[in-house]
Interface confidence: low
């Protein structure tokens, strides 16, 4: 580590005196920073000498000596005061620039350490500091304003009390720059716009930035629009607003509008689409199938998307029948607005009852007229089965009626013994009826089918079961004959499985 003679760390001299500062190290040494012309510099191997024959207040500062070859990078310093009764301050810089929230050092150095007790910082022409200005003083370095704010960017003077009077330094201009976190914030209103040809429209592009140095423009498709700009300042931000007002829109006004703003950090843009239409429109659609099938007892939400301009003047859900004259309860209907021109309407149908199958229509109205979207709701039912013994054309016949939706399939089983239901081990014969007769097939209702099993005689110790099934479930009915007999036979077209 180099050594400075005199040993310091401070040296106080009077103006006009001769000052010699010698730095000695193990290897070659050098003085840091720019040395003013008033000094003579002499280097000789491991020592370097600074000499001035006529010290002035401007020589007041810290002198630092380093040894470039030293791996530890050590340095030595001495602070020289040239105490001039007429010049208590040596100002090293007339302008200081910092970013907001950094410490700002105002480098006015006191030429006489005795004056330290009476120093203060003021604004130009002795005006007091702004409230909440937090600062400290070092006789070697000057005044430090801690965490400088944008508003503290002012002209300052350092003041020293000499006797009974305050002596000011020349002024130092502090510039506090705002930290720009990113591109300006943008809003483009509305996010989407639809107008009928001939109507008025307004599009507002506004941008805000932490400082005034930013640009904003509005672009239609690829064309930059020349619009007068309104500027403002509030909430500690600068605002610039562009308003495009169109008295009577036409098709050429339609298209993409982009609001673009830029600052030193970059560019930010947002877009909206302006659609010009010939006349009012009202479109109803659903992502659901308009033909719905739901199992009885389950719930269903019917959802309709509406695109409309101008806005809706009325809307409602209506049950069109065919079963009852009930209407959907208003509390089950829900409306949400996705944006200005698109809405979603939902009808909730919980725990559906047989009487609630049928047509549900959503109707909406705007100046473009009425539109309707109708859902057909069919309920699914598991099969219900019944078997009766009857005589047809003199022949004994088992008649099975199965009712459900979708249309049930019918299978006959003959099994050993008397039982409520044939299990696989007991089955003697299986007949699948490929074409049971459809007795009724009305819209939104169960389909009823009938299957016949002709029997010359039925065996008394056997059970005949009719089974029906569809996608919802299955049902069965077992028949146990009372009288004894010999055999049964299915119709010719039945599929026989032993």
């Amino acid at each position: 580590i180099p050594v400075i003679e005199p040993s310091g760390p401070e040296l106080v001299v009077k103006p006009g005196e001769m000052v010699t500062l010698r730095c000695v190290g193990n290897g070659s040494v050098e003085w840091d920073g720019p040395i003013s012309p008033h000094w003579t510099l002499y280097s000789d191997g491991p020592s370097s000498v600074l000499t001035t024959t006529n010290a002035t207040f401007q020589n007041t500062r810290t002198y630092r000596c380093t040894e470039p070859g030293d791996p530890l990078g050590g340095s030595a310093a001495i602070h020289l005061y040239v105490k001039d009764p007429a010049r208590p301050w040596n100002v090293l810089a007339k302008e200081v620039v910092v970013f907001e929230d950094q410490d700002a050092l105002l480098p006015c150095l006191l030429t006489d350490p005795v004056l330290e007790a009476g120093v203060s910082l003021v604004r130009l022409r002795g005006r007091p500091l702004l409230r909440h200005t937090n600062y400290s003083f070092s006789p070697w370095h000057g005044f430090t304003i801690h965490r400088a704010k944008f508003i503290q960017g002012q002209d300052y003077q350092c003041s020293a009390l000499m006797g009974s009077r305050k002596v000011m330094s020349i002024s130092i201009r502090l510039k506090v720059q705002k930290v720009i976190p990113g591109p300006p914030a943008l809003t483009l209103v509305p996010e989407e716009l639809v107008r009928i040809r001939g109507e008025a429209a307004q599009i507002v592009c506004s941008a805000s930035n932490i400082d005034v140095d930013f640009d904003v423009f509005l672009q239609h498709n690829t064309t930059k629009l020349a619009i007068p700009q309104r500027s403002d300042f509030h909430d500690n931000r600068y605002q610039k607003v562009l308003t495009l007002s169109l008295g009577q829109v036409d098709f050429q006004h339609a298209g993409n509008y982009s609001c673009v703003a830029s600052n030193v950090q970059g560019k930010h843009s947002t877009s909206m689409f302006f659609r010009v239409v010939e006349s009012a429109y009202l479109d109803l659609s659903s992502e659901q199938n308009l033909i719905q099938e739901v199992t009885v007892g389950e719930g269903l939400n019917l959802k309709v998307m509406v695109e409309a301009y101008p806005g809706l003047q009325g809307f409602n859900w209506t049950y069109l029948g065919p079963f009852s004259d009930h209407q959907p309860e208003p509390k089950l209907a829900n409306a949400t607005t996705k944006d200005t021109y698109r809405h979603t309407f939902t009808l909730s149908l919980p725990r559906l009852k047989p009487s609630e199958a049928g047509c549900y229509s959503f109707l909406a109205r705007n100046p473009g007229g009425w539109r309707a979207l109708t859902f057909e709701l069919t309920l699914r039912y598991p099969p219900e089965v019944s078997v009766i013994w009857t005589s047809i054309n003199g022949s004994g016949t088992l008649l099975c009626a199965a009712s459900g939706y979708p249309q049930p399939n019918v299978t006959w089983l003959q099994c050993a013994g008397h039982t409520d239901r044939c299990d696989e081990a007991q089955v003697l014969q299986v007949w699948v009826d490929p074409h049971p007769e459809v007795l009724s097939q009305e819209p939104f209702q169960k389909v009823t089918v009938q299957s016949l099993l002709t029997a010359e005689t039925l065996e008394h110790n056997q059970t005949y079961e009719c089974r029906a099934h569809n996608s919802v479930g299955s049902g069965s009915w077992a028949f146990i004959p009372i009288s004894a007999g010999a055999r049964t036979h299915p119709p010719d077209e039945f599929l026989f499985t032993p």
Partner: antibody
Framework: EVQLVESGGGLVQPGGSLRLSCAAS????????IHWVRQAPGKGLEWVSV????????YYADSVKGRFTISRDNSKNTLYLQLNSLRAEDTAVYYC???????????WGQGTLVTVSS | DIQLTQSPSSLSASVGDRVTITCRAS???????LAWYQQKPGKAPKLLIY???SLESGVPSRFSGSGSGTDFTLTISSLQPEDFATYYC?????????FGQGTKVEIK
């Protein structure tokens, strides 16, 4: 120049995954909904999926629902399609296409080929 | 979903011919939201017509579209050599978007 450029296609085994990208340039990307459309070799066009301009709405064809995921990064002007649980019938050229909101798909990419084969 | 069926599936024509392709929808296409595209081998489709009859910017005026409801038509008034391609109709509202199966126009 307004353009869309797809990438990320290639050969993948059944059950595998792939991520397609579509890079947009020459227009304000966030102002447009973008679709994916595919075309099996020698076949017609099939709509696959769409995502709204700011990514708040996504829709899928029934044939890909639950397997494919559409997304976009407006800061990068890029659209993505994540293809999972791939099947042989997903083999196709995949196109991204811009929806101008006034009708049809006005700008298409050149397409990227996805081949699903063992 | 709306199904679109194009006819014919393919046709042969000569340069200068008037060509008509039809597109039939399984249900009414709302507000004529129907587009026509041209596709050449190895290339992406190109938009010709939107809103059933609006000509896309830069498309030659020999292409025209008409129709509403369920029946739509693309007409090429005088076929040019560069028009030999496959043509698709598409409905673009509501989702899912659906395309016709295509009509291939070949040189006779």
């Amino acid at each position: 120049e307004v353009q869309l450029v797809e990438s990320g296609g290639g050969l993948v085994q059944p059950g595998g995954s792939l991520r397609l990208s579509c890079a947009a340039s020459g227009f304000t990307f966030s102002g447009y909904a973008i679709h994916w459309v595919r075309q099996a070799p020698g076949k017609g066009l099939e709509w696959v999926s769409v995502i709204s301009g700011y990514g708040s709405s996504t829709y899928y064809a029934d044939s890909v629902k639950g397997r494919f995921t559409i997304s976009r990064d407006n800061s990068k002007n890029t659209l993505y399609l994540q293809l999972n649980s791939l099947r042989a019938e997903d083999t196709a050229v995949y196109y991204c296409a811009r929806d101008p909101g006034v009708g049809g798909f006005d700008v298409w990419g050149q397409g990227t080929l996805v081949t699903v084969s063992s | 979903d709306i199904q679109l069926t194009q006819s014919p599936s393919s046709l042969s024509a000569s340069v200068g011919d008037r060509v008509t392709i039809t597109c039939r929808a399984s249900q009414s296409v709302r507000r004529r939201f129907l587009a026509w595209y041209q596709q050449k081998p190895g290339k992406a489709p190109k938009l010709l017509i939107y809103d059933a009859s609006s000509l896309e910017s830069g498309v030659p005026s020999r292409f025209s579209g008409s129709g509403s409801g369920t029946d739509f038509t693309l007409t090429i008034s005088s076929l040019q050599p560069e028009d030999f391609a496959t043509y698709y109709c598409q409905q673009y509202y509501p989702i899912p978007r659906t395309f016709g199966q295509g009509t291939k126009v070949e040189i006779k």
